[in-house]
C-alpha cells in the first residue's frame, strides 16, 4: 500500500537573528539549536494530522546580512492540506513563535513543490 506525499517549499525571514558562517555548518551549536527549534515549531503548527516533517533545511543571509532567511521543504500526507492552508496556519503562529522560540518571523512564502520530488527520508 503506497501512501502519497505532498511537498511544499517554504521560505521566511527571522529578523531578530544575525546570520553568520556557523549557520552554513550543520555541526555547530548555532545551526543545531536553530534547526531544533524550527523543527519543533513546525510540529506545533501542523499537529492537526498529516504532517510528516521537514527536509532540505537551509539558512541564508537576509538583506544586508542582518537577518536569517530559512528555506525548507514541508512534507504532508497527500490530501491533508493545500498551499493556502500551509501559509495561513504558519502566519497564524507568528506570535507564538516569538514568545515560545524567540523567533520574529516575516516575509513568508509558500509554494507547491512540483512532482517528482525526492526528499531526504531519515531513519525511524
Amino acid at each position: 500500500l503506497s501512501t502519497g506525499v505532498s511537498f511544499f517549499f517554504l521560505s521566511f525571514h527571522i529578523s531578530n537573528l544575525q546570520f553568520n558562517s556557523s549557520l552554513e555548518d550543520p555541526s555547530t551549536d548555532y545551526y543545531q539549536e536553530l534547526q531544533r527549534d524550527i523543527s519543533e515549531m513546525f510540529l506545533q503548527i501542523y499537529k492537526q494530522g498529516g504532517f510528516l516533517g521537514l527536509s532540505n533545511i537551509k539558512f541564508r543571509p537576509g538583506g544586508g546580512g542582518g537577518s536569517v532567511v530559512v528555506q525548507l521543504t514541508l512534507a504532508f500526507r497527500e490530501g491533508t492540506i493545500n498551499v493556502h492552508d500551509v501559509e495561513t496556519q504558519f502566519n497564524q503562529y507568528k506570535t507564538e513563535a516569538a514568545s515560545r522560540y524567540n523567533l520574529t518571523i516575516s516575509d513568508v512564502s509558500v509554494s507547491d513543490v512540483p512532482f517528482p520530488f525526492s526528499a531526504q527520508s531519515g531513519a525511524g
Partner: antibody, heavy 125, light 109 residues
Amino acid sequence: QVQLVQSGGGLVQPGGSLRLSCAASGFTFDDYAMHWVRQAPGKGLEWVSGISWNSGSIGYADSVKGRFTISRDNAKNSLYLQMNSLRAEDTALYYCAKDIGSGSYYNYYYGMDVWGQGTTATISS
Amino acid sequence: SSELTQDPAVSVALGQTVRITCQGDSLRSYYASWYQQKPGQAPVLVIYGKNSRPSGIPDRFSGSNSGSTASLTITGAQAEDEADYYCNSRDRYGNSLVIFGGGTKLTVL
C-alpha cells in the same frame, strides 16, 4: 480515546520465538512513527526498535539487531515485534509507544507520547 | 553510540523545587524528552522539545536545555510526583537509534 493495546507475551525457552502485537486506536496511526521499549525486572527503560510512518525507515538497538524484526500494518492500525533466538536477558516488560512525529523527512525525534500497557516476555528453561 | 547520564536518586521536600538533570553528547543536537514512571505503570511523557508539556501535565513541570545537559524542573513538588524519571533523545551517532537515561528515583519527603 487514544490508546495502544498490547498482546502476545508469554513464557518461552531460550532460542525460541515470540511475536508481540500492538493495536492502535483513537489517532491516525499512519501519521506517526512507532517504537518498542522494554524494561527488565527492576531496571530502567531500554529502546528496542522503531519504525517510521510508512515503514521506510527502521532502527534496532544493537542488543537485538539480527534477532528482532519490527513491522506495521497501517491498514490494520497495528504494530508488531517478531522476536527470534530469544535469550534470558531478553526477559522484560515490553511496551509499544507512539512517536510524536512521523520518523522521516529530517527525522527530528521529539519523544513518545502514548504508551501501551506492557506485555511480559519471560525467557527461561 | 551515545549515552545519557542521570543521577540515580534525588529527594525533595514537599512543596519545594527540584531539578533532575541528564547529560550526554546527543543533547547538543536533540532536545531531551522526559518520562514519569510510577510502580506498576507505563511511562508517561511529561516534557518534550524546548519546553512543551502534553495536555494533562501540570505546569509545575518544566524543561530546559544547555549544551550537553537537559534539566527537568518540578516547581512545588507534590507527593504524587514521587516516581522514576527518565530522559530520552535520539542517538547523535546513530540516526536510527533512540536512547534512554538510566533513570532518577525522585523521593518527595
